[in-house]
Interface confidence: medium
């Protein structure tokens, strides 16, 4: 709205940098062939690039990425009894970010 | 995968708490009737509840919310010239979070 402006602070741009985000661990990451199980924990923290850039045609992109394997529980329910197994999920953390030029989409030929 | 487990740390649940997120200021928040303008900054930081809960049937929800008005620039392009105006956008910050019971979905009658 273009209403009362007196108490409003100037909005500060959310700069392009890494922030802590919540990543949901989908079952497909662990087993694409079977859906009869649960994953624990269901979500973890990851570092991801986010924010805006000062110019158009640029986007906040990671310039350095690190893969981080973590152990989760794969809980299969078999005949009303849980079977716990360890599974490894590889998370992607962004270590550094940059406002990078977005390559123009190539025309379809 | 259930592959090599040696270097993987146990995954820690992303607990239910406030985290800094990037909120995109859409033009609709400022003027629903006109699309012929830009907003600056295009995005800002807000505090939002995120994460997972230890139990079933509960969700991470805000228990305390604060509205925060901020000033943005509304940049209208009139005859190829920019006209700057001030606009106020009200952001919503989450101050506290809790894992709250999700009410069972009512059956459609």
């Amino acid at each position: 709205s273009l209403g009362s402006l007196t108490i409003a602070e100037p909005a500060m741009i959310a700069e392009c940098k890494t922030r802590t985000e919540v990543f949901e661990i989908s079952r497909r990451l662990i087993d694409r062939t079977n859906a009869n199980f649960l994953v624990w924990p269901p979500c973890v923290e990851v570092q991801r690039c986010s924010g805006c850039c000062n110019n158009r045609n640029v986007q906040c992109r990671p310039t350095q990425v690190q893969l981080r394997p973590v152990q989760v529980r794969k809980i299969e329910i078999v005949r009303k009894k849980p079977i716990f197994k360890k599974a490894t999920v590889t998370l992607e953390d962004h270590l550094a970010c940059k406002c990078e030029t977005v390559a123009a989409a190539r025309p379809v030929t | 995968s259930l592959g090599s487990l040696t270097i993987a740390e146990p995954a820690m649940i992303a607990e239910c708490k406030t985290r800094t997120e990037v909120f995109e200021i859409s033009r609709r928040l400022i003027d629903r009737t006109n699309a012929n303008f830009l907003v600056w900054p295009p995005c800002v930081e807000v505090q939002r509840c995120s994460g997972c809960c230890n139990n079933r049937n509960v969700q991470c929800r805000p228990t305390q919310v604060q509205l925060r008005p901020v000033q943005v620039r509304k940049i209208e392009i009139v005859r190829k010239k920019p006209i700057f105006k001030k606009a106020t956008v009200t952001l919503e910050d989450h101050l506290a979070c809790k894992c709250e019971t999700v009410a069972a979905a009512r059956p459609v009658t």
Epitope: L38, W40, Q71, R73, I75, I77, K80, K81, P82, I83, F84, K85, K86 | L5, T6, E9, P10, N54, N55, R56, V58
Partner: antibody, heavy 120, light 106 residues
Amino acid sequence: EVQLLESGGGLVQPGGSLRLSCAASGFTFSSYAMSWVRQAPGKGLEWVSYISDDGSLKYYADSVKGRFTISRDNSKNTLYLQMNSLRAEDTAVYYCAKHPYWYGGQLDLWGQGTLVTVSS
Amino acid sequence: SYELTQPPSVSVSPGQTASITCSGDSLGSYFVHWYQQKPGQSPVLVIYDDSNRPSGIPERFSGSNSGNTATLTISGTQAMDEADYYCSAFTHNSDVFGGGTKLTVL
């Protein structure tokens, strides 16, 4: 204060029955799986039985299968262990313990235990 | 049925490092927890999910688990650490405890 308080132990003859109770307080009982663990005099810990948050999953150690029944009343914040056909080797301190998740996991809170003695 | 094997006793001098092992077939495929029990008291969780410490447990307690062996390590052992220690793992529909290790601080 978060705590578990067992009761119902005592002296019983072989072949007899006992019902143990575990009253939970200080946490949302209905959200967590629970277990019974026992310890014979001078011996180690032995897991006895488990029940999930809503009671839909239950399982037992082979040594008690068919004789013991675990149950819970979430409205009363209470866990139970019905013990039938008791044997001398069931003599032990019985602990109720809480898991941190609905499905199980480690045992992060233990009661003080109640002694069951099976003897003629 | 699955078995977890622990040494019956381990001795350590104050200030030294104590290591208690727990072995079982492919134990590294399961999450291992460790419990401390002092005479006349209920067990207390000291390590969960192989290597995590619950709040309130001193930093000198640590754990690892790979292959067929899990290890509880107590660095800078204190007299107050003298107790029985039990490993535990959830395997094949049942919680299994090791036989326990009596830690003596000389």
